[in-house]
C-alpha cells in the first residue's frame, strides 16, 4: 500500500485529544526498510486540534551523525531543528511555534510532534538523517483538515439553503432529491472555504429535502420538510 494512501491511526491520549501518526513499529521497519527509503514523500491529511507525530526514516540511532527537521510553513521562513549526536547538542533556527517539538530527547527518539494541530501547521516537514552510509530523507506534505459547520434552512417557498462553513478543504454538497441548484464558494484568508448551495424544488410531491455534505473529515446529512406553496390548500397524491 503506497504511503500516500495510508489510513490515519487514531488513539486517545489522557487529555482526550486524538493523536495521528504514520510511524512504524520495529517489525514494520525490518519489513519495509527499503520501501520507506524509496518513498520519501508522503501526503498526510491531519484533522485540526489533534496531535500529530512525524517520523524520520527508520535508521538505527547508533548509526546517526546528524538529524535535521526542516519545516516550511506558508508565509514563514524555513525553520530547522537539528541534533548532532557526537556533541549531543540541539540547535534551532527560525523556529517560533512552541507546539512543534521533539517527541522526547532526540538522542532517544528522532520523531517530531505537533501538539494541537492548527491551520497554520499546513506545510512541508522533512527529516534528514546523516549517516556514514549516506543521507536519508523523509518528507510530509501536511494538509490540515478543518471540519465544516453544516447548516440547513429555508429562505423562501420550496427553496432550501445548505451551508458548509469554514471547511478545509472545501466540502462537496449534494441533495436528495436533486433540485434546481446554485453553489457558491467563499474563500477565507486562513485557508478555509465556505460552500453554500441554494436549491429550489418545483415538483410538488417533494416533501423533505436532504443536504449531504461530503468532506475528508467525515460526511454529514441534514434534512428539512419543505414549506407549502402559498395559497395551496389541498392536494391528493
Amino acid at each position: 500500500q503506497p504511503n500516500n494512501s495510508l489510513m490515519l491511526q487514531t488513539s486517545k491520549e489522557n487529555h482526550a485529544l486524538a493523536s495521528s501518526s504514520l510511524c512504524m513499529d520495529e517489525k514494520q521497519i525490518t519489513q519495509n526498510y527499503s520501501k520507506v527509503l524509496a518513498e520519501v514523500n508522503t501526503s498526510w491529511p491531519v484533522k485540526m486540534a489533534t496531535n500529530a507525530v512525524l517520523c524520520c526514516p527508520p535508521i538505527a540511532l547508533r548509526n546517526l551523525i546528524i538529524i535535521t527537521w526542516e519545516i516550511i510553513l506558508r508565509g514563514q521562513p524555513s525553520c530547522t531543528k537539528a541534533y548532532k549526536k557526537e556533541t549531543n547538542e540541539t540547535k534551532e533556527t527560525n523556529c517560533t511555534d512552541e507546539r512543534i517539538t521533539w517527541v522526547s530527547r532526540p538522542d532517544q527518539n528522532s520523531d517530531l510532534q505537533i501538539r494541537t494541530v492548527a491551520i497554520t501547521h499546513d506545510g512541508y516537514y522533512r527529516c534528514i538523517m546523516v549517516t556514514p552510509d549516506g543521507n536519508f530523507h523523509r518528507g510530509y506534505h501536511l494538509q490540515v483538515l478543518v471540519t465544516p459547520e453544516v447548516t440547513l434552512f429555508q429562505n423562501r417557498n420550496r427553496t432550501a439553503v445548505c451551508k458548509a462553513v469554514a471547511g478545509k478543504p472545501a466540502a462537496h454538497i449534494s441533495w436528495i432529491p436533486e433540485g434546481d441548484c446554485a453553489t457558491k464558494q467563499e474563500y477565507w484568508s486562513n485557508g478555509t472555504v465556505t460552500v453554500k448551495s441554494t436549491c429550489h424544488w418545483e415538483v410538488h410531491n417533494v416533501s423533505t429535502v436532504t443536504c449531504h455534505v461530503s468532506h475528508l473529515t467525515g460526511n454529514k446529512s441534514l434534512y428539512i420538510e419543505l414549506l407549502p406553496v402559498p395559497g395551496a390548500k389541498k392536494s391528493a397524491k
Epitope: 436528495i176 410531491n205 417533494v206 416533501s207 436532504t210 434534512y223 420538510e225 395551496a232 389541498k234
Partner: antibody, heavy 114, light 107 residues
Framework: QVQLVQSGAEVKKPGASVKLSCKAS????????MHWVKQAPGQGLEWIGN????????NYDEKFQGRATLTVDTSTRTAYMELSSLRSEDTAVYYC???????WGRGTLVTVSS | DIQMTQSPSSLSVSVGDRVTITCQAS??????LHWFQQKPGKAPKLLIS???NLEDGVPSRFSGSGSGTEFTFTISSLQPEDAATYYC?????????FGQGTKLEIK
C-alpha cells in the same frame, strides 16, 4: 421535548364519522407539518396525509382523499383528523406524528362495528 | 408513488447473532428514510433517523447505513428485548411510504 397527546379510543357504527385529536407541545406548532398514519390490526403502517398548521395546506393519499379531513386549531395547538362514512376496514389505530416523523403520538384506536 | 420493498418479512434469530434488514426504493429514485421498532400495543419507536443517525438513548448495537435507493438496518448482537417488528419509512416524497415490516423473533 415534543409531546403529542391523542384522544381516547372510539367505537363507531358503520356509516358514522369520527373526529380524532392530537394536541402538541414542546415545539413551534405552526412551523412543522403534522402527519397522520393508520395501522389496522396485525397490519403495517399507512400514511393518510399531512397538514401544515401555519397555512392550512394539506396533502392526502389518494386512498383517503374524500373521506379523511385534516384540520388544525392553532390557538390550542391541536390537529384533528375526521374520517367519514366509516366501514369495518377503518378499524385501526391512528397515529399523529410531526418533526419529519421523529415524534409520534401514542395512537387512538377506532373500532367500527355494528 | 415510491414503493419501499423491505426484506425479509420475518426472521427467527438467536440471541447474540447479527441481524440485517434491507429496504429498497422503487423506480431507482433516491430517498431518505427512518427505521422504527414497534412492539405489540405500542407506537413505533424511532431508532435511526435520516438513514444512519442513531437516536438518543438507542443502544449502539443498532445501526443504519446506505444511501440513494438501498438501505440497511443492522443489529450487531441481538438481545431478547429486540423481538419486535421493524419498519422503514421514506419521507422524501408524498405520499410517505413504509416498508411492509420485518417481524423479528428470538429463537
Amino acid at each position: 421535548q415534543v409531546q403529542l397527546v391523542q384522544s381516547g379510543a372510539e367505537v363507531k357504527k358503520p356509516g358514522a364519522s369520527v373526529k380524532l385529536s392530537c394536541k402538541a407541545s414542546g415545539h413551534t406548532f405552526t412551523s412543522y407539518w403534522m402527519h397522520w398514519v393508520k395501522q389496522a390490526p396485525g397490519q403495517g403502517l399507512e400514511w393518510i396525509g399531512n397538514i401544515y398548521p401555519g397555512s392550512g395546506s394539506i396533502n392526502y393519499d389518494e386512498k383517503f382523499q374524500g373521506r379523511a379531513t385534516l384540520t388544525v386549531d392553532t390557538s390550542t395547538r391541536t390537529a384533528y383528523m375526521e374520517l367519514s362514512s366509516l366501514r369495518s376496514e377503518d378499524t385501526a389505530v391512528y397515529y399523529c406524528l410531526t418533526m419529519t416523523g421523529t415524534s409520534w403520538g401514542r395512537g387512538t384506536l377506532v373500532t367500527v362495528s355494528s | 408513488d415510491i414503493q419501499m420493498t423491505q426484506s425479509p418479512s420475518s426472521l427467527s434469530v438467536s440471541v447474540g447473532d447479527r441481524v440485517t434488514i434491507t429496504c429498497q426504493a422503487s423506480q431507482g429514485t433516491p430517498i431518505n428514510l427512518h427505521w422504527f421498532q414497534q412492539k405489540p400495543g405500542k407506537a413505533p419507536k424511532l431508532l435511526i433517523s435520516g438513514a444512519s443517525n442513531l437516536e438518543d438513548g438507542v443502544p449502539s448495537r443498532f445501526s443504519g447505513s446506505g444511501s440513494g435507493t438501498e438501505f440497511t438496518f443492522t443489529i450487531s448482537s441481538l438481545q431478547p428485548e429486540d423481538a419486535a417488528t421493524y419498519y422503514c419509512l421514506q419521507f422524501t416524497y408524498i405520499p410517505w411510504t413504509f416498508g411492509q415490516g420485518t417481524k423479528l423473533e428470538i429463537k
